[in-house]
Interface confidence: medium
């Protein structure tokens, strides 16, 4: 091409015009194009219906552009990426209709001072989403709604004051939250929800440390190894986690983990915390909680990094949480990690009520009622948008899983309420070697054991029970892969998707959930 | 790789019906799916898209005649064409959005559609 390189890899055909003093995209670019670089020109203004004739374009960068205005006519309907940091972006496009297929989306330094409702309305297959160094003030609750599959939010280095209590509703997948550097003095109650979060970065904010910052210093306790700092140009995976990053503003930089709460109400004998602990749907008898219903959690994706193993966590219904496909090249605005594929613990554990007391963490998940896919905004010239009709009985949910092209995996389905203990494949064989003793009622860390090779010494220091809880060794045979999720009735069967021999578990392995 | 494989194309005459098929080799209910058709001498045309969340997309100039939807237990795809015109002919294209942005689109190998007049 006589302006921009043009190189084949593998099954990629890209075409770099980055640095080129462009003001338009170039004429006669290769129709089979995948891969568009733009960066470093002076558009301006870009039109994405100009790039509809290349139906195989799958990432576009228009970063470092001067682009004042983007202009979303037309649809692309297989585009996966596209790069817009770096602009002197006003307001955020609404690009739910004319990029159906969007994962990735990179606003980063831009000049948005705020977003709609409906912003992100449509991109129902965003996975990663990065608004770093933007003028945001504040964040409309329900932003991230239509946007179930995200994995990786980032949010840094804007004038965030306050944050929606529900912003992170139905994220199952979020693994990545980085919030650092804005102007926010509080968590409110419930905003994290209950699954983990691996990787949270929420220095450089003038946590303001009263009694309402009790939620969040009782989940920074409980996530201690999951807060981290951001240095810029250092790979995510060489950052050490700092928890006492994260500094009460008007307490001479004091950790807002160790903030005492000295004076704030309490319920009870048991101590200030639990009033701010976020127990939904509980049922209280007393100073206990009674675990109604049986959800057990399980980690489901590894993280490599130099630490160890970390390991986020769904339900027993088997959410879907892939990991990310990220381009080998980072760019410094992608806070991004790479995580390897996905792998199911190879045990069965058959569990009976149990009641806790009320201070160990909670882990409690609502069951999120299945919704349909999101509106699309105003449709583009030349396209009508059809929603999908909910069925009144049986509603599809919006976020589906994530099969990876050679691994297929299973659907998400919310967990049922146990009735009896059914196994999904063959039940378990009786052990060789001698069952388990059950957790005793003492505080002691008992030994579980799990394919009767690997150990996990759980922390369960706060247990108390009223029944017996043994978990037995899991059947060797494996379980196939499952196009839909096993009905899961009290009993979990799973098993080690590669052939990795026996990795180290978390020791927060977690049991029982409370209503 | 995804192989996707249409079918159901052929001859028709104006007003007539047909319906196209796409099978895929593997899952595909994570992504987004659709038909771009490409009449001789012209460019390809997006034609009907579905998303994984189900919500359906079409051009224009076929709107009320055609609709697409999907069976992910099969993992296919169809569109649906009634009141065909001869503006219609074209070779149709089943295409696969990425899974990520890092992915390629997948394509099938096309079939004809001819109506006729």
């Known amino acids: 091409h006589p302006i921009c390189e043009v190189s084949k890899v593998a099954s990629h055909l890209e075409v770099n015009c980055d640095k080129r003093n462009l003001t338009a995209l170039p004429p006669d670019l290769p129709k089979d194009t995948t891969i568009l670089h733009l960066s470093e020109n002076l558009l301006y203004t870009f039109s994405l219906a100009t790039l509809m004739p290349y139906t195989r374009l799958t990432q576009l960068n228009l970063d470092r552009c001067e682009l004042t205005k983007l202009q979303v006519d037309g649809t692309l309907p297989v585009l996966g990426t596209l790069d817009l940091s770096h602009n002197q972006l006003q307001s955020l496009p609404l690009l739910g209709q004319t990029l159906p297929a969007l994962t990735v989306l990179d606003v980063s330094f831009n000049r948005l001072t705020s977003l709609p409702l409906g912003a992100l309305r449509g991109l129902g297959e965003l996975q990663e989403l990065y608004l770093k160094g933007n003028e945001l003030k504040t964040l409309p609750p329900g932003l991230l709604t239509p946007t179930p599959k995200l994995e990786k939010l980032s949010l840094a280095n804007n004038n965030l004051t306050e944050l929606p209590a529900g912003l992170l509703n139905g994220l199952e997948n979020l693994d990545t939250l980085l919030l650092q550097e804005n102007s926010l003095y509080t968590i409110p109650k419930g905003f994290f929800g209950s699954h983990l979060l691996p990787f949270a970065f929420l220095h450089g904010n003038p946590w303001l440390c009263n009694c309402e910052i009790l939620y969040f210093r009782r989940w920074l306790q409980d996530n201690a190894e999951n807060v981290y700092v951001w240095k810029q140009g250092v790979d995510v995976k060489a950052m050490t986690s700092n928890v006492a990053s994260v500094q009460c503003d008007n307490s001479d930089k004091f950790p807002v983990y160790k903030y005492p709460g000295k004076g704030c109400p309490t319920l009870g004998d048991e101590g200030d915390t639990d009033l701010y602990d976020y127990y939904p749907e509980e049922d209280t008898e007393g100073d206990k909680v009674r675990a109604t219903r049986t959800v057990v959690k399980f980690p489901t994706k590894a993280h490599t990094t130099p630490w160890g193993l970390f390991y986020s966590w769904s339900t027993a219904s088997l959410d879907s949480q892939m990991p990310s496909s990220l381009h080998p090249t980072q760019e410094s605005t992608k806070e991004q990690t790479t995580f390897p594929p996905r792998w199911t613990p190879n045990f069965t554990l058959h569990m009976e009520s149990i009641t806790f007391s009320k201070t160990p963490k909670s882990t409690t998940e609502p069951t999120p009622s299945p919704t349909t896919s999101e509106p699309v905004p105003e449709p583009a010239p030349n396209m009508t948008t059809l929603e999908p009709t909910p069925s009144p009985t049986t509603p599809e949910p919006t976020s589906e899983p994530a099969p990876s092209p050679t691994t297929p995996e299973p659907t998400s389905e919310p967990a049922p309420s146990p009735t009896t203990p059914e196994p999904t494949s063959e039940p378990a064989p009786s052990p060789t070697t001698p069952e388990p003793t059950p957790i005793p009622t003492i505080a002691t860390s008992p030994t579980i054991l799990v394919s009767a090779t690997s150990l996990i010494t759980p922390k369960s220091t706060f247990l108390t029970t009223t029944k017996p809880v043994s978990l037995l060794e899991s059947t060797k045979k494996t379980i196939p892969e499952l196009d839909q999720p096993p009905k899961l009735r009290g009993v979990l069967q799973g098993h080690l998707e590669s052939s990795r021999n026996d990795p180290f578990l978390h020791p927060d392995f977690c049991c029982l959930l409370p209503l | 790789e995804v192989q996707l494989v249409e079918s159901g194309g052929g001859l028709v005459q104006a007003g007539g019906s047909l319906r196209l098929s796409c099978a895929a080799s593997e899952t595909f209910s994570i992504r987004a799916m659709g038909w771009y058709r490409q009449a001789p001498g012209k460019q390809r045309e997006l034609v009907a898209y579905i998303t994984s969340g189900g919500s359906t997309n079409y051009a224009d100039s076929v709107k009320g005649r055609f609709t697409i939807s999907r069976d992910n237990d099969r993992n296919t795809v169809s569109l649906q064409m009634n009141s065909l015109k001869p503006e219609d002919t074209a070779v149709y294209y089943c295409?696969?959005?990425?899974?990520?942005?890092?992915?390629?689109?997948?394509w099938g190998q096309g079939t004809q559609v001819t109506v006729s007049s």
């Open positions: 295409y696969q959005a990425p899974r990520s942005g890092y992915d390629p689109v997948y």
